[in-house]
């Protein structure tokens, strides 16, 4: 089959990191520089990614693959394959329009990236507040106010481990 | 050669909807974020949205936040604006730009009139 | 959206220097060394001039140079000539993905 197709279409024998050039009677050319060609018979090679302002060069183009990109220190990376560069906030805040803005009462952002969310209702799970929440941390929830009646135990010792297949010591 | 080749515009009534189209090539699509970006007859740029190479982060301008759907088919090299509510001043030729803003397509005109 | 404000007009005769300044604040172009500037003709797209406030993609003159101070940016071009008249606008990093453009200045060549 290989043979049957690379003489119907001599392109197919150009490798990586070359392009099957139909000026020149559809030779295989090298990709000229700062570009690429990552599988063989292409007709083109692709232009390099240029990791410039926010972003940082995390791997240098070659001919057969393209450049890879992260963000400068300050910044976090979004999508797959970091095309997008966003201020980092401190915790406790979330990126606006206007910058980095503290999280309203009620709510919290333990990372540099993201939106701050909503302190957990602690009373719709029936549970009381243990820790009251930051701006910087979710509340901690406690038993139930039931639980916590005189001569109750508040705190119930988790009971042993065991894991499939063994039997306890 | 990158090319960006922008179609869909036209003439539409206000509250009437456009779907504009990017093809892109010469360079690996599915790697960059996209933007559109437009401008208005003789005036100047504004910036409407952009999307991550996956689709997983969009951010619109305030002007046309709930009307404006920014997509993109990755394995069609192909980005979409999707207009609904149009209004007089959406008029604009509208281009679409790769990330950074190093390479634009010619554009395509909208014209919303009654 | 807030916007950078540019002097709406520029001029200057073949052989010298003009420079457009481009003002934003410190969430944008003083908070960054993010500013790009653009050349448009008429009835054409954009074309990325500078970026990085300083730095030119290949192809461009070296008579096209950037430079930051504060909030503001500058583009100057020097020996000027005819084919640089053109409308220009600068765009700034503003942290978050919401970019910024410049209100636009038309450059004559007298």
């Known amino acids: 089959f290989e043979r049957t197709r690379s003489l119907q279409d001599p392109c197919s024998n150009c490798p990586a990191g070359t392009f099957c050039d139909n000026n020149r009677n559809q030779i295989c050319s090298p990709c000229p520089p700062n570009s690429f060609s990552s599988a063989g018979g292409q007709r083109t090679c692709d232009i390099c990614r240029q990791c410039k302002g926010v972003f940082r060069t995390r791997k240098e183009c070659s001919s057969t693959s393209n450049a890879e990109c992260d963000c400068t220190p300050g910044f976090h990376c979004l999508g797959a394959g970091c095309s997008m560069c966003e201020q980092d906030c401190k915790q406790g805040q979330e990126l606006t329009k206007k910058g980095c803005k503290d999280c309203c009462f009620g709510t919290f952002n333990d990372q540099k990236r993201g939106i701050c969310r909503p302190w957990t209702n602690c009373s719709l799970d029936g549970k009381s507040v243990l820790v009251n929440g930051t701006k910087e941390r979710d509340v901690v929830c406690g038993p139930s106010p039931a639980d916590l009646s005189p001569g109750a135990s508040s705190v119930t010792p988790p009971a042993p481990a065991r894991e499939p297949g063994h039997s306890p010591q | 050669e990158v090319q960006l080749v922008e179609s869909g515009g036209g003439v539409v009534q206000p509250g009437g909807s456009l779907r504009l189209s990017c093809a892109a090539s010469g360079f690996t699509f599915r790697t960059y974020a996209m933007h559109w970006v437009r401008q208005a007859p003789d005036k100047g740029l504004e910036w409407v949205a952009i999307i991550s190479d996956d689709e997983t982060h969009k951010y619109y301008a305030d002007s046309v936040k709930g009307r404006f759907t920014i997509s993109r088919d990755n394995s069609k090299n192909t980005l979409f604006l999707q207009i609904n509510g149009l209004r007089a001043d959406d008029s604009a030729v509208y281009y679409c730009a790769v990330h950074d803003f190093d390479f634009w397509g010619q554009g395509t005109l909208v014209t919303v009139s009654s | 959206q807030s916007v950078l404000t540019q002097p709406p007009s520029a001029s200057g005769s073949p052989g010298q220097s003009v420079t457009i300044s481009c003002t934003g604040t410190?969430?944008?172009?003083?908070?960054?060394?993010?500013v790009s500037w653009f050349q448009q003709h008429p009835g054409k797209a954009p074309k990325l001039m500078i970026y990085d406030v300083n730095k030119r993609p290949s192809g461009v003159p070296d008579r096209f140079s950037g430079s930051k101070s504060g909030n503001t940016a500058s583009l100057t071009v020097s020996g000027l000539q005819a084919e640089d008249e053109a409308d220009y606008y600068c765009?700034?990093?503003?942290?978050?993905?919401?970019?910024?453009f410049g209100t636009g200045t038309k450059l004559t060549v007298l």
């Open positions: 410190n969430s944008d172009i003083g908070g960054y060394n993010y």
């Open positions: 765009s700034s990093f503003a942290g978050s993905n919401n970019s910024i």
